[in-house]
């Protein structure tokens, strides 16, 4: 009945509703049906959210912050439904809502506690700063303050820097980790306890590959089954790092099954893609192809980064010409 939010039942006519920032929610309230229905929704026992009586809405005294954001299920009022449909919730909407329902038979009051969470999809970035390499887990907008944990080779790391900036609505958080010279795998988890939502970023460094000029190279990229769900929308991006910045070679969108290739020497095997193997081939290597290649598989719930270092060496012919 109430698909837009989830409730936790607590004692004393009080329910908790958890909504997401900018999404619509329903504050539930029901009553024993009767004639002459009066419904008054109030916030923090002070502000008028919505009033209905004598068969219609009466919003003359409605607090301006709720204008054009509330409505009732008018066809269901006679069946005992006094729930409030609430559009585009913000963090300022958090708090206690009281629903007063009166009929010719009885008056009841229900309390609903609204909690609002934010969890814009986090990202895991790989960055070079001078001679240092960093993994950065970041989330642009999150509320309440999330729990961030790092693991190295599946072992929790105590060192956990958090750069936090708070705005009126939410937090923006960066958690950088220096991984210079490391061949370990790293995992970052960001958990929003309110929304019961967890995102994981995983970084794996593959062994370096040495290739000769004009040869081709195969670079593997297969998702870890623990995180990967082919039913969920995801995006795969292959990019190459040159002088500290990545340029995109190709990407694939699972929703449309589209592949976009920006480098003519790059090839993807369609059959392998159908088996969730996003390994790629780069043909006709030249010296400038040396560098780091990054495969990024991302969804709302995870980012899987696989990095390959490729060294392209001059072929014997080229060396003798020089």
């Amino acid at each position: 009945i109430f698909p837009l939010a989830f409730f936790i039942y607590v004692p004393m006519n009080e329910q908790i509703v958890i909504g997401r920032l900018d999404e619509d929610i329903i504050l539930p309230s029901s009553f024993e049906r009767g004639s002459e229905v009066v419904i008054h929704w109030k916030y923090q026992d002070s502000y008028k959210v919505h009033s209905y009586y004598k068969g219609s809405d009466h919003l003359e005294s409605q607090d301006p912050r709720y204008a054009n954001r509330t409505s009732l299920f008018y066809n269901e009022i006679q069946n005992g439904n006094a729930s409030l449909f609430f559009r585009r919730v913000s963090l300022l909407d958090e708090g206690i809502y009281t629903c007063y329902v009166g009929t010719a038979i009885q008056v009841i009051t229900n309390k609903v506690v609204l909690k609002v969470g934010v969890f814009l999809t986090p990202v895991m970035k790989y960055e070079k700063r001078n001679t240092n390499s960093f993994l950065i887990c970041s989330v642009l907008s999150v509320y309440p303050r999330p729990i961030i944990t790092w693991k190295m080779d599946n072992t929790p790391i105590s060192e956990n820097n958090m750069e936090e900036t708070g705005s009126l609505d939410s937090f923006s958080i960066n958690s950088p980790l220096n991984i210079t010279g490391s061949n370990s795998s790293y995992e970052c988890t960001i958990e929003n306890s309110l929304l019961k939502q967890t995102w994981t970023g995983r970084w794996t460094m593959k062994d370096g590959l040495h290739k000769m000029q004009s040869e081709h190279v195969s670079l593997s990229c297969q998702p870890v089954n623990d995180y990967f769900s082919p039913n969920q929308d995801f995006k795969v991006t292959w990019s190459r790092m040159k002088s500290g910045t990545f340029s995109v070679l190709a990407y694939y969108l699972s929703s449309s099954q589209n592949t976009i290739i920006n480098e003519s020497r790059f090839s993807w095997n369609k059959e392998l893609i159908n088996q969730s193997d996003f390994s790629m081939n780069l043909m006709d290597l030249n010296l400038s192809d040396s560098g780091e290649y990054l495969c990024n598989i991302s969804s709302d719930e995870y980012t899987l980064l696989t990095i390959h270092t490729v060294h392209v060496e001059p072929s014997q012919e080229t060396a003798s010409h020089n």
């Epitope: 009066v38 009586y53 009166g102």
Partner: antibody
Framework: QVQLVESGGGVVQPGRSLRLSCAAS????????MHWVRQVPGKGLEWVAV????????DYADSVKGRFTISRDNSKNTLYLQMNSLRVEDTAVYYC?????????????WGQGTLVTVSS | DIQMTQSPSSLSASVGDRVTITCRAS??????LAWYQQKPGKVPKLLIY???TLQSGVPSRFSGSGSGTDFTLTISSLQPEDVATYYC?????????FGPGTKVDIK
């Protein structure tokens, strides 16, 4: 059962003030709107004022607007009518009355009334 | 503000007679009308609300009808205990004005 008991009536000179009280019992006072209605002995009923269950809205008859103030204390289950600048024509029996619901309907229970006499 | 008028202002009828009282609003009030009975020396008592709904405990000889501006209260068979003044009240919106009343007694 619903009980409403008015008090505070009496004889007062024109221009003076009086405060009526109404003690409510037998129902959840804070859930219901309340009215004051008056009646000159031998004459008709005149609606005076209403206050919503949560005191968020109040309305008055034109004849008392600006002079009378309706209020309530839900923690004490008590309704009040503060009457200032009283006039001879305010002489009446004042009834405290319970609204059907929140303060937007008709009266379903009445008190016995308290007599206010404004006379010099 | 909406004015309420009642007619007649008084009437005398015999026991068993059918009695009709009219209440008129100066503007439409849908069915937001209540009728009260006030016996001599007593407080008013709710008889009918929503123009035609009988309050519980009220004898079925009382009935109400009408909508908009014209309303009637009917006593199908007048009884001695019905001697009283009858008031209509509009409650569509404040002020919740009463009609001037109709006094009913027995011939």
């Amino acid at each position: 059962q619903v009980q409403l008991v008015e008090s505070g009536g009496g004889v007062v000179q024109p221009g003076r003030s009086l405060r009526l009280s109404c003690a409510a019992s037998g129902f959840t006072f804070s859930n219901y709107g309340m009215h004051w209605v008056r009646q000159v002995p031998g004459k008709g009923l005149e609606w005076v004022a209403v206050i919503w269950y949560d005191a968020s809205e109040k309305d008055y008859a034109d004849s008392v607007k600006g002079r009378f103030t309706i209020s309530r204390d839900n923690s004490k289950n008590t309704l009040y009518l503060q009457m200032n600048s009283l006039r001879v024509e305010d002489t009446a029996v004042y009834y405290c009355a319970k609204d059907l619901i929140s303060g937007i309907y008709y009266v379903d229970h009445w008190g016995q009334g308290t007599l206010v006499t404004v006379s010099s | 503000d909406i004015q309420m008028t009642q007619s007649p202002s008084s009437l005398s009828a015999s026991v068993g007679d059918r009695v009709t009282i009219t209440c008129r609003a100066s503007q439409g009030i849908s069915n937001y009308l209540a009728w009260y009975q006030q016996k001599p020396g007593k407080v008013p008592k709710l008889l009918i609300y929503a123009a035609s709904t009988l309050q519980s405990g009220v004898p079925s000889r009382f009935s109400g009808s009408g909508s908009g501006t014209d309303f009637t209260l009917t006593i199908s068979s007048l009884q001695p205990e019905d001697v009283a003044t009858y008031y209509c009240q509009k409650y569509q919106s404040a002020p919740f004005t009463f009609g001037p009343g109709t006094k009913v007694d027995i011939k």
